[in-house]
C-alpha cells in the first residue's frame, strides 16, 4: 500500500484544473482541508461509494488493487486512511503558536434523522468534527442562516450568504462544511515601510493597484527554463511551513505554466536538491485571499459520482437509506502580511542597506501560482492561482 501522498497530489491537480475551468479570477483551496472532509465522508460510506472516494486519497500497487478485496481488507484500508489523516491533522497543528492554522469540519444533519453512534464518535476522534442538528424539515431557512453564521464564526469574516436563500430545503438531510484559515509569521519579516502601492497587471492591458511588500534576503530559488518561470520558497517561522511562488516571466505566461504542470513536476521543483539558496529581491502583494466552493459539482467532474447521488451508500453513517451529502462546501482563507520574526543581524537585511542589483528579482506584479507546504508531513496546505487582487 502506498500512502496518502501520490493520489492526493494527483487529486490536487485534478481539483485545481476543474476549479480553474469554472473560475475566471483567483483559485484558492486547501487540499488538506478537502482531504479531511472527504475522509469524514469515507468514514460514513460503504461499498462502491467508499471505494470511489478512497481512490482519490489513496493509491495502491497495481496487483493489489486489481483483485477483489474482502470486507476485512476494505475496513483495514479505510482505517488506515482515517489514521493517516488523523496523524496529518495532529502533525500540522503541532506548532500552532507560530502560526494560526484552523481546520474546521462540521456536518449539519437533519435533526430527526438517526445517525450511528459509532460514526458520531469516530468523526470526533479522527477529525475533531461534530454533527450539528438542524431542522431542515420545518425550518430550512433558519437552518440555512444557522449554517451561514457558523461558517462566519470560523474565519471572523463576513460571508455574504454562503448558502443563498432557497439553496437548502425541507428534503436536505446532510450538509458538510470544511473551512481552513491560515495566517503565519514569516521567518524574515517584510518591513512595513518598504511596502508601496504598485500596479498588479491582470493582463498586458489591465492593472489594479496592490500593496506590494518588499524584502531582499536569502531564499530557496530556481529558474524553470522550460516554463519560462521562477520559483521561490518563502519560509514561515521555524521553517515548518513554506510558501512557494511560481511566477511566469511574462505577464500572460501563466497559462503556459499550467499546461505543462504535473504532480511529478511539482514534487520535483520543490525538492531540496532542485532549489538553491540565492539572494532574492522579492516583491509580493499583501494578500487576503478567500474562496468558497460547493465541491459537489467539482468532485463529480473529477470522477466522484456516487457520493452525492440518491443511490449513495451512507450505511456507515445511518441505518436509514436515502441519506447522502447534498452539499459539500469548502472555504479557505489566507492572510499574507509583512509580519514575521524581527530581523536580527545577519538575517534578511532591508532593501535600503543591501544592493538590489546583487539579488534575483522576483516581482509578483502579474498572475502567479502559489502553494503552502508543510515540511514534516510533506503535505500541501493550500494551492492557489492569484490573478486578480
Amino acid at each position: 500500500m502506498d500512502s496518502l501522498g501520490t493520489a492526493a497530489t494527483q487529486f490536487l491537480f485534478d481539483l485545481f484544473k476543474e476549479l480553474n475551468k469554472t473560475n475566471d479570477g483567483n483559485v484558492f483551496f486547501s487540499p488538506v482541508g478537502i482531504s479531511t472532509a472527504i475522509g469524514m465522508i469515507i468514514l460514513g460510506t460503504r461499498g462502491a461509494t467508499a471505494s470511489e472516494l478512497q481512490k482519490v486519497l489513496y493509491t495502491e500497487q497495481g496487483t493489489e488493487s486489481s483483485r477483489i478485496k474482502s470486507e476485512e481488507e476494505e475496513i483495514e484500508k479505510r482505517e488506515e486512511i482515517h489514521h493517516q489523516l488523523q496523524m496529518l491533522l495532529t502533525e500540522i497543528s503541532k506548532f500552532s503558536n507560530d502560526y494560526d492554522l484552523i481546520i474546521s469540519n462540521r456536518l449539519f444533519g437533519e435533526k430527526t434523522y438517526l445517525f450511528l453512534q459509532k460514526y458520531i464518535d469516530y468523526v470526533e476522534k479522527y477529525y475533531h468534527a461534530s454533527l450539528e442538528p438542524v431542522d431542515f424539515v420545518n425550518a430550512a431557512d433558519e437552518s440555512r442562516k444557522k449554517i451561514n453564521s457558523w461558517v462566519e464564526s470560523q474565519t471572523n469574516v463576513k460571508v455574504k450568504d454562503l448558502f443563498p436563500e432557497g439553496s437548502l430545503n425541507s428534503s436536505t438531510k446532510l450538509v458538510l462544511i470544511n473551512t481552513v484559515y491560515f495566517k503565519g509569521l514569516w521567518d524574515r519579516e517584510f518591513k512595513k515601510e518598504h511596502t508601496k502601492e504598485e500596479d498588479f497587471w491582470l493582463n498586458k492591458n489591465l492593472s489594479k493597484p496592490v500593496q506590494m511588500m518588499a524584502l531582499c534576503s536569502s531564499f530557496n530559488f530556481t529558474f524553470l527554463e522550460d516554463l519560462q518561470a521562477k520559483i521561490v520558497g518563502i519560509p514561515y517561522k521555524n521553517n515548518d511551513i513554506s510558501m512557494f511562488v511560481l511566477l511566469p516571466n511574462d505577464i500572460d505566461g501563466l497559462e503556459k505554466i499550467m499546461d505543462k504542470m504535473s504532480p511529478e513536476k511539482l514534487v520535483e521543483w520543490t525538492s531540496p536538491g532542485h532549489l538553491e539558496q540565492r539572494r532574492v529581491d522579492l516583491r509580493l502583494p499583501r494578500l487576503q485571499v478567500e474562496e468558497t466552493y460547493d465541491l459537489e459539482p467539482v468532485l463529480e467532474a473529477v470522477g466522484i459520482h456516487s457520493a452525492f447521488s440518491e443511490h449513495a451508500d451512507y450505511s456507515g453513517m445511518s441505518a436509514r437509506s436515502g441519506l447522502h451529502a447534498q452539499n459539500f462546501l469548502h472555504r479557505s482563507f489566507l492572510v499574507v502580511t509583512e509580519e514575521g520574526v524581527e530581523a536580527t543581524a545577519g538575517t534578511g537585511v532591508g532593501l535600503k542597506v543591501s544592493s538590489a542589483a546583487s539579488c534575483e528579482l522576483v516581482h509578483c506584479n502579474h498572475p502567479f501560482l502559489f502553494f503552502i507546504r508543510h515540511r514534516e508531513s510533506d503535505s500541501i496546505l493550500f494551492f492557489g492561482k492569484f490573478s486578480s487582487p
Epitope: R106, K111, Y113, L114, Q117, S130, P133, G316, S318
Partner: antibody
Framework: QVQLQESGGGVVQPGRSLRLSCAAS????????MHWVRQAPGKGLEWVAV????????YYADSVKGRFTISRDNSKNTLYLQMNSLRAEDTAVYYC??????????????????????WGQGTLVTVSS | DVVMTQSPLSLPVTPGEPASISCRSR???????????LGWYLQKPGQSPQLLIY???IRASGIPDRFSGSGSGTDFTLKISRVEAEDVGVYYC?????????FGQGTKLEIK
C-alpha cells in the same frame, strides 16, 4: 438484507443458567448498538438490556440487573445474553433487536440506543422445575 | 420507572375507517433537545414487533403514510387514517427517554 437469529433458548430449572446468542447478518454489526427485549407468554413487551457498538456501555432493566450480562463478539457478528439465577418470571420469548441510531443533540452530543429495528424472530426460554 | 398507559386496550375497526390509540406517560418525555422520546411498535399475530414511529411523529423506514404519530410531553396519539386488514395486531407505545425503557400494555386492533 438485515437478519437477526436468536438461539440458545429451552427449558431450564430455577436457579440455573442459560446463554442466548443472536447471530447478525446483512449489516456491519460492529457499528450498531444492540438490545434484548422479552415477552412473557400472552403478555406485553419488556426491555431487558442494551450494549453499545463497541461493548463499552451496557444498561439493564432493574429486574435482571446483577443476574443477566449482555455482551458481544464483533469478530463473530454475535450478541449474547448470559442469564444466571433464573426465576420462573424470566420465562419469555427473548428477542434481540438492532438499535436504529442516535438522535444528534447540540454539537457532538447525542442520545444513542433508543429505538429497536429490526427484531429477530425470538427464542423461548422456559424456567420451570 | 416511567409508567406508560394505553387506551383503549381493544379496538375493533371497520376496514377503510380511521383508528386512534392514545398513550400517556407518568412524566414528560420531552428531552431538552426538543424531541419527544416516544415510539410506537406493532406486533402482528405470530410475528416479532416492528417499529412504526419514533420521536413521537417520525415514520420509520417503509411504514405507510396512513400511520401518523402526534403529541408532546405526556400525551401521545397514533392514528391510522384508513385501516387495512394487514394492520391487525397489538400496538405498543414505548418511552425511550431513560433506561429502563418501558412499554404500554398494548392495544389490540382487530377487524370488525
Amino acid at each position: 438484507q438485515v437478519q437477526l437469529q436468536e438461539s440458545g433458548g429451552g427449558v431450564v430449572q430455577p436457579g440455573r443458567s442459560l446463554r442466548l446468542s443472536c447471530a447478525a447478518s446483512g449489516f456491519t454489526f460492529s457499528s450498531y448498538g444492540m438490545h434484548w427485549v422479552r415477552q412473557a407468554p400472552g403478555k406485553g413487551l419488556e426491555w431487558v438490556a442494551v450494549i453499545s457498538y463497541d461493548g463499552s456501555n451496557k444498561y439493564y432493566a432493574d429486574s435482571v440487573k446483577g443476574r443477566f450480562t449482555i455482551s458481544r463478539d464483533n469478530s463473530k457478528n454475535t450478541l449474547y445474553l448470559q442469564m444466571n439465577s433464573l426465576r420462573a418470571e424470566d420465562t419469555a420469548v427473548y428477542y434481540c433487536a438492532r438499535d436504529l441510531g442516535a438522535v444528534i443533540a447540540v454539537a457532538g452530543t447525542s442520545t444513542p440506543y433508543n429505538w429497536f429495528d429490526p427484531w429477530g424472530q425470538g427464542t423461548l426460554v422456559t424456567v420451570s422445575s | 420507572d416511567v409508567v406508560m398507559t394505553q387506551s383503549p386496550l381493544s379496538l375493533p375497526v371497520t376496514p377503510g375507517e380511521p383508528a386512534s390509540i392514545s398513550c400517556r406517560s407518568r412524566q414528560s418525555l420531552l428531552h431538552s433537545n426538543g424531541h419527544n422520546y416516544l415510539g410506537w411498535y406493532l406486533q402482528k399475530p405470530g410475528q416479532s414487533p416492528q417499529l412504526l414511529i419514533y420521536l413521537a411523529s417520525i415514520r420509520a423506514s417503509g411504514i405507510p403514510d396512513r400511520f401518523s404519530g402526534s403529541g408532546s410531553g405526556t400525551d401521545f396519539t397514533l392514528k391510522i387514517s384508513r385501516v387495512e386488514a394487514e394492520d391487525v395486531g397489538v400496538y405498543y407505545c414505548m418511552q425511550a427517554l431513560q433506561t429502563p425503557y418501558t412499554f404500554g400494555q398494548g392495544t389490540k386492533l382487530e377487524i370488525k
